[in-house]
């Protein structure tokens, strides 16, 4: 048994161009917290596969508010270590996922909203009891600096936390063949109970007489390295130089799978099929429990009351993923009207409206005519978020405030002369034409193409356009 410890040193913009925007603002202050997920082995596992070695959540960091105009600095971090206890042997090789989460502290309905800011992952070799290992990982424009180590919990010692130490029975020295337990020099190694010849570096046991191998080693005494090159068969050529499995005992001999797991050989090694509730290369690790708080965003954890039963997160509406860490894309329903851009903030949907529209869903066509009368008897006409004035005769301009020259457009046809008049324009028609715009020819016999002119108005006289 032991504890994996993670110390976050900094989280902020990485080097190079394209610095990220601060995740917090004066309007939406926020604070960070971190989640670590550990899995045994070096296999590329999906982000959603169980955190079989364990998971932990940090405390919340200090509240941070962006300084307007300032670049995003390293953000204030939570105090303390993230600690992931492990019950069984430390596997020596492990995969990690470290997530940086943002908790928004605005006045949103229903409490704070969480969103995933960055996720980094990696695979490492690490011996328990060793010094702190430093690491830098980048996620997009963000950079995370951290250190980690695995340490054994007494009475366990060793690179896999599988050797046990006991207080000395005699004050001066340990019993025959037993060494002092560094760094606990006042304690002695417990008597070995593993199978005779079991490799002290690559093997361990939890029951007398057994020999179980750490990852990368196989054979009845855990002395055979598992091949990293391809062999002709599971029992490939017998050569110390190839690193292939030697003929003789197969990788499943002695069943390396713990907790009732069943072993099957693979071309390079073996594979354990684990019973419900157990994970890892050898089924040596039990799953995360609900006590570890694996469900995000208010997800309800069921099952997983003890390490022998797997947990399930029942996600609240709008969230999904095995840990309720993903949002449902509500913007795909296109709730914003009039071409507005949809933003899902988690606690609410927001619409960024196009010019001329407003409202929570861009539903309001901005009424530019409200309180903006057109002058001189003009009428306001709306459309597409803009407005225009339809001006009375003799006036023009945006608000009908300019006196229009009614003759500017040369409205009189067939050479008629135009005169501006207080109520519009008047056309004085050339001989042979008549009408308000001199548009009608006078027939040669003196009759017009129009009904008879009103009394007192002869063809060719100026006609006033009303």
């Amino acid at each position: 048994a032991g504890v994996f410890e993670l110390q976050i040193h900094s989280f902020g913009p990485g080097p190079g161009p394209g610095a990220p925007r601060s995740p917090c603002s004066a309007r939406l202050p926020c604070r960070l917290f971190f989640r670590v997920c550990l899995k045994p082995g070096l296999s590329e596992e999906a982000a959603e596969s169980p955190c079989a070695l364990g998971a932990a959540l940090s405390a919340r960091g200090p509240v941070y508010t962006e300084q307007p105009g300032a670049p995003a600095p390293d953000l204030p971090l939570p105090d303390g270590l993230l600690q992931v206890p492990f019950r069984d042997a430390w596997p020596g090789t492990f995969s990690f996922i470290i997530e940086t989460w943002r908790e928004e502290l605005g006045d949103q309905i229903g409490g704070p909203a969480w969103s995933l800011l960055a996720r980094v992952a990696g695979r490492r070799r690490l011996a328990a009891g060793g010094p702190w290992a430093r690491d830098i990982q980048r996620a997009g424009a963000w950079e995370l600096r951290f250190s980690y180590r695995a340490r054994c919990e007494p009475p366990a010692v060793g690179t896999a936390c599988t050797r046990l130490c006991r207080p000395r029975s005699a004050p001066s020295r340990c019993g025959p063949g037993l060494r002092p337990c560094a760094p606990l020099e006042d304690e002695c190694e417990a008597p070995l109970v593993c199978r005779a010849g079991c490799s002290p570096e690559h093997g361990f046991c939890e029951q007398p007489g057994e020999c179980r191998c750490l990852e990368g080693w196989t054979g009845p005494l855990c002395t055979v390295p598992v091949s990293t090159s391809s062999c002709l068969s599971p029992r490939g050529p017998s050569s110390a130089t190839t690193g292939c499995l030697v003929p003789g005992p197969g990788p499943c001999d002695g069943n390396p799978c713990a907790n009732g797991g069943s072993c099957s050989e693979t071309p390079r090694s073996f594979e354990c099929t684990c019973p419900r509730g157990f994970y890892g290369l050898r089924c040596e690790v039990s799953g995360v429990t609900c006590a570890d708080g694996p469900c995000f965003n208010g997800g309800l954890c069921v099952g997983g009351a003890d390490p022998d039963s797997a947990y399930i997160c029942h996600c609240p509406p709008g969230f999904q993923g095995s840990n309720c860490e993903k949002r449902v894309d509500r913007c795909s329903l296109q709730p914003c009207r009039n071409g507005g851009l949809c933003l899902d903030l988690g606690h609410a949907l927001r619409c960024r409206c196009r010019a001329g529209f407003a409202g929570p869903r861009c539903e309001h066509d901005l009424d530019d005519c409200a309180g903006r009368a057109c002058a001189n008897g003009g009428t306001c006409v709306e459309g597409g978020g803009a407005h225009r004035c339809s001006c009375a005769l003799g006036f023009g301009g945006r608000d009908c405030r300019e006196r229009a020259d009614p003759c500017a457009a040369r409205p009189c046809a067939h050479g008629g002369r135009c005169y501006a008049h207080f109520s519009g324009l008047v056309c004085a028609c050339a001989p042979g034409y008549m009408g308000a715009r001199c548009e009608f020819p006078v027939h040669p016999d003196g009759a017009s193409a129009l009904p008879a002119a009103p009394p007192g108005l002869r063809p060719g006289d100026p006609q006033r356009y009303l």
């Epitope: 509406p317 509500r330 869903r361 861009c362």
Partner: nanobody, 119 residues
Framework: EVQLVQSGGGLVQPGGSLRLSCAAS????????IGWYRQAPGKQRDMVAG???????TYADSVKGRFTISRDNAKNTVYLQMNSLKPEDTAVYYC?????????????WGQGTQVTVKP
Amino acid sequence: EVQLVQSGGGLVQPGGSLRLSCAASGSDFSINAIGWYRQAPGKQRDMVAGFTGDGVTTYADSVKGRFTISRDNAKNTVYLQMNSLKPEDTAVYYCAADVKIGGDYEWFWGQGTQVTVKP
């Protein structure tokens, strides 16, 4: 508070049809956008079909030509007619609505309806 109550669903053979309905109830509300999402085991919850805020119908590419969304405004009900069903349509189907209550907009989900397509 607005309730979205779903009905329909069930087991059907490939090539068969089903009709889902979703009735919205509550007081003093108006529906802005409404539609259907679905979630297959181990997969994301994705939009299937809907009426957008502008009242336009929208469909996921995988269901175009097979599924039809319709509504009855008088009953505040939306329907999803599913034809030519395939095994990959098996999922829990959720009704979703963006609803205006007073001056605010809120998002609501139905309780979910299982649709299983298998021979």
